[in-house]
């Protein structure tokens, strides 16, 4: 439906740095009208680092996570904080720097091959928007030897875009975050205009793919002041009219 398209907002407009979630995007979002009834955000708190406002981890850089800056601080005020290095305390995966994950409250290396039995209780600790992909793990013990680093396929639960297979990003859908396809040329996207409001989104779109940016769809049949959809378009410096 038109409503669901217009309310399917992009997470960000630029591709993420290699191997991780995107950096600081500008964002503007709208909740789907009339049907959902969010009961409020309750976030825990952690130490201060830098004052970039955020609502979820995906809005922060690959070496950051989103949380309230002080213990017991205002849950509504969150900023991007520096990730925790190996052996530092953590409450969830997103707090740990890339290459690490949160196990028993401590950031540990995820470089070695971790098996299902070793991480059964440490896949993720909730703290804001936190869902680690378990794609490739069966919860049946007979299939427990699949590797932790198996990339999530479409529809798999994820924590960040680097959890997802190539061509996919980690985006919110209903009350989870799942791997969805990165947008292709011509697909509808949302140009974000406001920072720190991703918590309102329930249907996030991925960012536009490499070489594309989210721009107003050129439609000469519409008046210039009418609202127009944004689509993923090839990068152009300027639109010059060349005479051949």
């Amino acid at each position: 439906t038109l409503n669901s398209v217009l309310n399917s907002n992009a997470i960000k407009n630029l591709p993420p740095p290699l191997g991780g979630a995107a950096g600081h995007p500008g964002s503007a979002v709208s909740a789907a009208p009339g049907i959902l009834y969010p009961g409020g955000n309750k976030y825990q708190t952690i130490d201060n680092y830098q004052p970039y406002p955020c609502a979820e981890d995906e809005e922060c850089g690959t070496d950051e996570y989103c949380a309230s800056p002080t213990r017991g601080g205002d849950a509504g005020v969150q900023i991007c904080l520096a990730c925790r290095k190996r052996r530092k305390r953590c409450m969830r995966h997103a707090m740990c720097c890339p290459g690490n994950y949160c196990k028993n409250g401590i950031c540990v290396s995820s470089d070695q091959n971790h098996f299902r039995g070793e991480i059964e209780e440490t896949i993720t600790e909730s703290f804001g928007n936190d869902h680690s992909t378990l794609d490739g793990y069966s919860r049946r013990t007979t299939l427990s030897s699949k590797m932790y680093h198996t990339k999530g396929q479409e529809g798999s639960v994820c924590l960040r875009s680097s959890d997802c297979a190539s061509g996919l990003c980690c985006a919110r859908h209903f009350w989870s975050k799942i791997c969805k396809p990165v947008l292709k040329e011509g697909q509808v996207c949302t140009k974000h205009r406001r920072k720190g409001s991703h918590g309102l989104e329930i249907f996030q779109r991925c960012y536009c793919g490499e070489g594309l940016s989210c721009r107003i769809q050129k439609d000469h049949h519409q008046a210039s002041n009418s609202s127009r959809l944004h689509t993923c378009q090839r990068h152009h410096h300027h639109h010059h009219h060349h005479h051949h």
């Epitope: 049907i35 969010p38 009961g39 209780e121 600790e125 919860r139 798999s156 639960v157 989870s176 249907f203």
Partner: antibody, heavy 117, light 111 residues
Framework: EVQLVESGGGLVQPGGSLRLSCAAS????????ISWVRQAPGKGLEWVAS???????YYPDSVKGRFTISRDNAKNSLYLQMNSLRAEDTAVYYC???????????WGQGTTVTVSS | EIVLTQSPATLSLSPGERATLSCRAS??????????MNWYQQKPGQAPRLLIY???KQGSGIPARFSGSGSGTDFTLTISSLEPEDFAVYYC?????????FGGGTKVEIK
């Protein structure tokens, strides 16, 4: 092994209240979305409420304002506070979670709620 | 909300036969390049069990005889060769829009 065990069902009069619980084990409970889905006798399935890993709550129109979903991550427990119960709320109530994909991929065995005078 | 209509209401087949169940949505359940259609199996007195998600992806531990197909508004669950334990009620469910909705179910019974 992932386990979800519901409790708290029973017989209640119209207008009454009931609190359902769901005890979870076998996964890091706090990280995942978890929901209540119900099934009236001899009928199909109906989504009732959900709570995300980031503690947002969601309801359909049919129960909004009457039911409240909540979770206690320290106790690995999910709750459904049901007020102003109606005969049409009579059903088996299941807790279900989304661990590997966006669908309801793990379910409890359900607890029966009967609203009758 | 999106209404899902399943057909037939009842399917009478013998073990070893192929079962084809249909689910039609009142509007497309495709978005983000994914078909948000899921299938569940429910046996009497038991909780539902996820068989298929995203129209064609198998849930954990689901036998290969269960497969899903379709996109947009029309979806099919196929059981290639019915086993005795497959006789149950099957529900489709969409996750494209809130509220997530279920179909009325198809009962697969022994002929």
């Amino acid at each position: 092994e992932v386990q979800l065990v519901e409790s708290g069902g029973g017989l209640v009069q119209p207008g009454g209240s009931l609190r359902l619980s769901c005890a979870a084990s076998g996964f890091t409970f706090s990280s995942y979305a978890i929901s209540w889905v119900r099934q009236a006798p001899g009928k199909g399935l109906e989504w009732v409420a959900s709570v995300s890993g980031w503690m947002d709550t969601y309801y359909p129109d049919s129960v909004k304002g009457r039911f409240t979903i909540s979770r206690d991550n320290a106790k690995n427990s999910l709750y459904l506070q049901m007020n102003s119960l109606r005969a049409e709320d009579t059903a088996v109530y299941y807790c279900a979670t989304s661990l590997e994909n966006y669908a309801f991929d793990y379910w409890g065995q359900g607890t029966t709620v009967t609203v009758s005078s | 909300e999106i209404v899902l209509t399943q057909s037939p209401a009842t399917l009478s087949l013998s073990p070893g036969e192929r079962a084809t169940l249909s689910c039609r949505a009142s509007e497309s359940v495709d978005d983000f390049g994914i078909s948000f259609m899921n299938w569940y199996q429910q046996k009497p007195g038991q909780a539902p069990r996820l068989l298929i998600y995203a129209a064609s992806k198998q849930g954990s531990g689901i036998p290969a005889r269960f497969s899903g197909s379709g996109s947009g508004t029309d979806f099919t669950l196929t059981i290639s060769s019915l086993e005795p334990e497959d006789f149950a009620v099957y529900y489709c469910q969409q996750s494209k829009e809130v509220p997530p909705t279920f179909g009325g179910g198809t009962k697969v019974e022994i002929k």
